[in-house]
């Protein structure tokens, strides 16, 4: 799942992995864009084991893997995007 | 050449335990996702664990978790299956695999010979 | 968890014969999807990953196709060394391997 949250909460990561994690082994990616308490983005992911990680946003494979889903949006995906308003 | 030697199958009764290992050479072992994976004697393959490049990260079947563990020893090339209260139907050959990844797909490339667990009484 | 149908289980052939096999994933794979072969006392040998890409060696006699949820595995012309059992494996959420065909000498 890749979801995209609006928060007025402040930074959720202590801190960031680059280490890769394969698609297969990822439950949900949650994106946290900065602002509104927080000055960076935050890329937090669940992962199969039910453990979480917060990833470097920078990181060229969660950004490759990112677009991948971006791309993907359209069909019904084992990884579906939600995107989650301002509430 | 890429290479993956288990070892440590045998025959043990119902409740007991017993340590695969796996030696890997010909490649730099900690750039690798590693797994292991078991065929019944005339059944499918079936995929039972798999662990990160450090060891960090674990991933189970759900058949086995809570009673199998998963590790490795980078320094050793070598991967390890640690398997408690083996049932009748842990019997199996148990494989050990490379997991090649670039994007999560290109998976699995390299595989040892197998090593056999019979759990009988 | 995602469930890999394989058919047919079994398939009898002679050389030169195309065949084909099929993966029904119950679930979108997309082309996440690898197919291996296994001669008996042997460990599996990859021949296609992500759906229709080649394993280096494997020759041009293999193919694969599909995407979503149906794959097919076709052999162009049987040869003598291609009777084994063939497996797919699908790597999009964790590892679900299908049941298995056995192609045998008809």
């Known amino acids: 799942v890749l979801e995209v949250y609006y928060t007025s909460l402040r930074c959720r990561c202590v801190q960031e992995s680059s280490v890769f994690i394969p698609r297969r082994f990822i439950d949900r990616i949650q994106i946290l864009p900065r602002g509104n308490g927080c000055p960076r983005k935050e890329i937090i992911v669940w992962k199969k084991n039910k453990s979480i990680v917060c990833v470097d946003p920078q990181a060229e494979w969660i950004q490759r893997m990112m677009e991948v889903l971006r791309k993907r949006s359209s069909s019904t995906l084992p990884v579906p995007v939600f995107k989650r308003k301002i509430p | 050449e890429v290479q993956l030697v288990e070892s440590g199958g045998g025959l043990v009764q119902p409740g007991g335990s017993l340590r695969l290992s796996c030696a890997a050479s010909g490649f730099t072992f900690s750039d690798y996702y590693m797994a292991w994976v078991r065929q019944a004697p005339g059944k499918g393959l079936e995929w039972v664990a798999s662990i990160n490049y450090d060891g960090g990260d674990t991933y189970y079947r759900d058949s086995v978790k809570g009673r199998f563990t998963i590790s490795r020893d980078n320094a050793k090339n070598s991967l390890y299956l640690q398997m408690n209260s083996l049932r009748a139907e842990d019997t199996a050959v148990y494989y050990c695999?490379?997991?090649?990844?670039?994007?999560?797909?290109?998976?699995?490339?390299?595989w040892g010979q197998g090593t056999l667990v019979t759990v009988s009484s | 968890d995602i469930q890999m149908t394989q058919s047919p289980s079994s398939l009898s052939a002679s050389v030169g014969d195309r065949v084909t096999i099929t993966c029904k994933a119950s679930q979108n794979i997309n082309k996440e999807l690898t197919w291996y072969q296994q001669k008996p006392g042997k460990a599996p040998k990859r021949l296609i990953y992500n759906t229709n890409i080649l394993q280096t060696g494997v020759p041009s006699r293999f193919s694969g196709s599909g995407s979503g949820t149906e794959f097919t595995l076709t052999i162009s012309s049987l040869q003598p060394e291609d009777f084994a059992t063939y497996f797919c494996?699908?790597?999009?959420?964790?590892?679900?391997f299908g049941q298995g065909t056995k192609l045998e000498i008809k």
């Open positions: 695999a490379r997991e090649e990844d670039y994007d999560g797909s290109y998976v699995m490339d390299a």
């Open positions: 494996l699908q790597q999009s959420s964790l590892y679900t």
